[in-house]
């Protein structure tokens, strides 16, 4: 985890000021996979290499962010740098550090539910867990699951317990959780949507 981000940063920091400017302009018009948004022009043009790396990873996640960066570099005629970037991101990923769950390689691909995409942020940032549980009780959560989540001492541990049940959920179950989030913490959903 972080290998692709480091490789993107390494590539962008090796660009001259003129090349970085050209990279940003090309990023505004490069074809994107269906479903991906474009980084707003105003924010993009003022970014340095570090900010731009963070923005690329937050908009496209690591795998697609690296692929997109390599495509733009190739389009600029920087084939060798693009090759180095792709080689770096395709090396064996190794084990994730203790306590960190490595995201699936398909993290931002269509077909991955919003709830799954933003698992870590939701665990960290949802505060109104009891409200969610009441909204999901009987529809998605059994009584036993409901009690198990409620028994956890903190909001993050409650959310972590809730997410331990989601692998068994289908798309519509996840939609019901998302609806509850839209109703209880709309600002958080909006924030994650933007990222």
């Amino acid at each position: 985890m972080g290998r692709a981000r480091d490789a993107i940063l390494d590539a962008l920091e090796n660009l001259t000021a003129e090349e970085l400017k050209k990279f940003k302009l090309k990023l505004l018009s490069v074809p994107l996979r269906e479903g991906y948004g474009r980084i707003p022009r105003g924010a993009l043009l003022s970014m340095d290499a570090l900010d731009l790396t963070d923005k690329l990873v937050s908009f496209y996640l690591e795998t697609y962010g690296a692929e997109l960066t390599a495509n733009v570099l190739r389009d600029m005629g920087l084939q060798e740098m693009a090759g180095q970037l792709q080689a770096a991101t395709h090396q064996g990923s190794g084990a994730a550090p203790a306590g960190i769950q490595a995201p699936p390689q398909s993290a931002a691909k269509p077909g991955l539910h919003f709830i799954d995409q933003h698992r870590a942020a939701l665990i960290a940032r949802v505060t109104n867990v009891e409200w969610l549980l009441d909204a999901l009780y009987g529809k998605v959560l059994t009584d036993e699951q409901y009690q198990a989540v409620r028994a956890e001492p903190t909001n993050p541990s409650k959310m972590r317990k809730l997410f331990s049940f989601t692998p068994a959920w289908n798309w519509t179950c996840k939609d019901l959780l998302l609806q509850a989030l839209r109703e209880s913490q709309s600002y958080l959903v909006e924030d994650l949507e933007r990222s």
């Epitope: 479903g35 269509p110 077909g111 539910h113 919003f114 798309w171 519509t172 609806q179 709309s186 909006e190």
Partner: antibody, heavy 122, light 107 residues
Framework: QVQLVQSGAEVKKPGSSVKVSCKAS????????IHWVRQAPGQGLEWMGY????????MYNEKFQGRVTITADKSTSTAYMELSSLRSEDTAVYYC???????????????WGQGTLVTVSS | EIVLTQSPATLSLSPGERATLSCHAS??????LSWYQQKPGQAPRLLIY???NLHTGIPARFSGSGSGTDFTLTISSLEPEDFAVYYC?????????FGQGTKLEIK
């Protein structure tokens, strides 16, 4: 490009069922939800429900619960909407629609089929 | 379910004028609202999503605003092709619902 092509117009008797198809192309069928929306003559739009072909789960508008069934055939990239126990007030144009993208935090319908007119008449 | 009420039911204006269409939600829907245009015999067309985001390919004369329960679609200077029926739709909770529509007609 994304295309949704629906089956042709149908005339049905009250009490019978109708099954409308929606063939999708131009994207990965199993990655996106397909919704059904109907519009009675001269009236507004009414959401009926959706299917997520990736796991075949469906969600329905409770108004139609028990009468509507939405299914999908992954092998042909086709979604189906079956409405049973038809009555005259079910006469409407039935649209299939695909959201801008399904893994965002909402459903806004950017792609629509051409519509299928279902007439219920004795 | 969330009820969306659009006003006015009919709006009569001339090309070049500014059009303001309203959509009121029966409860708070935050920013989860979209706008569609529909012409006779055609499927609806997405104009605006998440209250104010302009969909790809939609002219800049269309804009959306609002949050909570009150939303507005504005067409800054009407073109002949803008005369149609406009619908709002909420994406906050199920069932998804639409307004009853506003017919924009030539004066």
């Amino acid at each position: 490009q994304v295309q949704l092509v629906q089956s042709g117009a149908e005339v049905k008797k009250p009490g019978s069922s109708v099954k409308v198809s929606c063939k999708a192309s131009g994207y990965t069928f199993t990655d996106q939800t397909i919704h059904w929306v109907r519009q009675a003559p001269g009236q507004g739009l009414e959401w009926m429900g959706y299917i997520y072909p990736g796991d075949s789960s469906a969600m329905y508008n409770e108004k139609f619960q028990g009468r509507v069934t939405i299914t999908a055939d992954k092998s042909t990239s086709t979604a189906y909407m079956e409405l049973s126990s038809l009555r005259s007030e079910d006469t409407a144009v039935y649209y299939c629609a695909r959201p801008l993208y399904s893994y965002a935090s909402y459903y806004w319908f950017a792609y629509w089929g051409q519509g299928t007119l279902v007439t219920v008449s004795s | 379910e969330i009820v969306l009420t659009q006003s006015p039911a009919t709006l009569s204006l001339s090309p070049g004028e500014r059009a303001t269409l309203s959509c009121h939600a029966s409860q708070n829907i935050n920013v989860w609202l979209s706008w569609y245009q529909q012409k006779p015999g055609q499927a609806p067309r997405l104009l605006i999503y998440k209250s104010s985001n302009l969909h790809t390919g939609i002219p800049a004369r269309f804009s959306g605003s609002g949050s909570g329960t009150d939303f507005t679609l504005t067409i800054s200077s009407l073109e002949p092709e803008d005369f149609a029926v406009y619908y709002c739709q909420q994406g906050q909770s199920y069932p998804l619902t639409f307004g009853q529509g506003t017919k924009l007609e030539i004066k």
